[in-house]
């Protein structure tokens, strides 16, 4: 019951996290203009991974997409890549985890298979969360390094005077959404990995066997097979003694008055 709850909760937490990563990636407020001590205008500028927007006090908003890949900073491309990889891994992880859920029965899927799928999805969620956290952190670092004090250096440029005002940009809402979402996905992944341990069947040292009594007296050693979870060292299926004892896998025993099961 606890395993099912842990797995289910891990799935839900990861689902929320991945939804958050998608939302953060699509949001325009990755960097927002610091309006304090801004000598330029009262028009608010905020930028995302895909476009730049200006919003006026009247409520009018205009957004323009970054039209070229060549003119964009390499770091922005890296952030885009990290976020997309995070989303893709998270989406695959969700797909795998749906089939791995203990509360969902698909044909005659064994617990060991579900355990494997739970572990796989858990690892995918962890990597997805780390990608999102890394992407957001790289962008945040870009913001910190670009957080110049507003300067107005007048110089004569091509075609006229250019007043260079390095407007300060600060952390936008998308960064916080991304960090939280990445964290949730990471936590969800860890929960799935924990649930996986509970799903794996325990190793047992017994197996049902049928043996055929031979004419002469035979010493019988049980324990011909050892059940394996698939995670530990897979014990070799060795015959202990061949004096009439057979496991069910080795030979089909025919009904006889001497058969004991």
């Amino acid at each position: 019951m606890a395993v099912t709850a842990c797995q289910g909760l891990g799935f839900v937490v990861s689902l929320i996290g991945i939804a958050g990563i998608i939302a953060a990636t699509c949001m325009d407020q990755w960097s927002t203009q610091d309006l304090y001590n801004n000598p330029v205008t009262a028009v608010f500028n905020y930028q995302g991974l895909w476009r730049s927007c200006v919003r006026e006090s009247s409520g009018f908003t205009e957004c323009r997409g970054y039209f070229t890949l060549l003119g964009l900073p390499a770091m922005l491309q890296a952030v885009r890549a990290l976020m997309i990889v995070g989303i893709v891994l998270g989406a695959i992880g969700l797909l795998v985890s749906i089939f791995a859920l203990k509360c969902i029965r698909i044909g005659s899927m064994e617990d060991s298979a579900k355990a494997n799928m739970t572990l796989t999805s858990g690892i995918m969620f962890i990597v997805s969360g780390l990608c999102a956290i890394a992407g957001v952190s790289v962008f945040a670092n870009m913001l910190v390094t670009n957080f110049w004090m507003s300067t107005a250096n007048m110089y004569t440029g091509m075609g006229g005077m250019v007043q260079t005002v390095q407007t300060r940009y600060t952390f936008g809402a998308a960064l916080f959404v991304g960090w939280v979402a990445g964290g949730l996905t990471l936590i969800g992944g860890v929960m799935m990995c924990i649930a996986c341990r509970g799903l794996a069947p325990e190793e047992t040292n017994y197996k049902a066997v049928s043996y055929h009594a031979s004419g002469h007296s035979v010493a019988y050693k049980p324990g011909g097979f050892k059940a394996s979870t698939g995670f530990g060292s897979n014990t070799k299926n060795k015959k202990i003694y061949d004096g009439g004892a057979r496991t069910e896998d080795e030979v089909q025993s025919y009904p006889s008055k001497h058969d004991y099961v």
Partner: nanobody, 120 residues
Framework: EVQLVESGGGLVQAGGSLRLSCVAS????????MAWFRQTPGKQRELVAG???????NYADSAKGRFTISRDNAKKTIYLQMDSLKPEDTAVYYC??????????????WGQGTQVTVSS
């Protein structure tokens, strides 16, 4: 590099009209604000009129009722229609643009100016 090119200046009689235009070119994402400033010898550059992307306008007291600023966002151009010109309107008129050129890049650019002379 962003360039602002003004045109339309010249010599005009008092009471006459002129239409100035300014076109922005180069790598531009957004132009939150475009404005006209003027400067007379020995004086500070002063705002004449400004217009935002959304069309919100702002005029200097001396320009209200006589000057009209308009904007064509698609052409990245602003216009200043100057009517009922007075000799005190004589100045070099500069185009100004607040331009977002890229990620975390927002600069203010100036044109080279166009001379407007109003004779009495």
């Amino acid at each position: 590099e962003v360039q602002l090119v003004e045109s339309g200046g010249g010599l005009v009689q008092a009471g006459g009209s002129l239409r100035l235009s300014c076109v922005a070119s180069g790598t531009i994402l957004n132009i939150p604000l475009m404005a006209w400033f003027r400067q007379t010898p020995g004086k500070q550059r002063e705002l004449v009129a400004g217009i935002t992307t959304g069309g919100t306008t702002n005029y200097a007291d001396s320009a209200k009722g006589r000057f009209t600023i308009s904007r064509d966002n698609a052409k990245k151009t602003i216009y200043l229609q100057m009517d009922s010109l007075k000799p005190e309107d004589t100045a070099v008129y500069y185009c100004n643009a607040d331009v977002v050129t890229g990620l975390m890049r927002r600069n203010v650019y100036w044109g080279q100016g166009t001379q407007v002379t109003v004779s009495s």
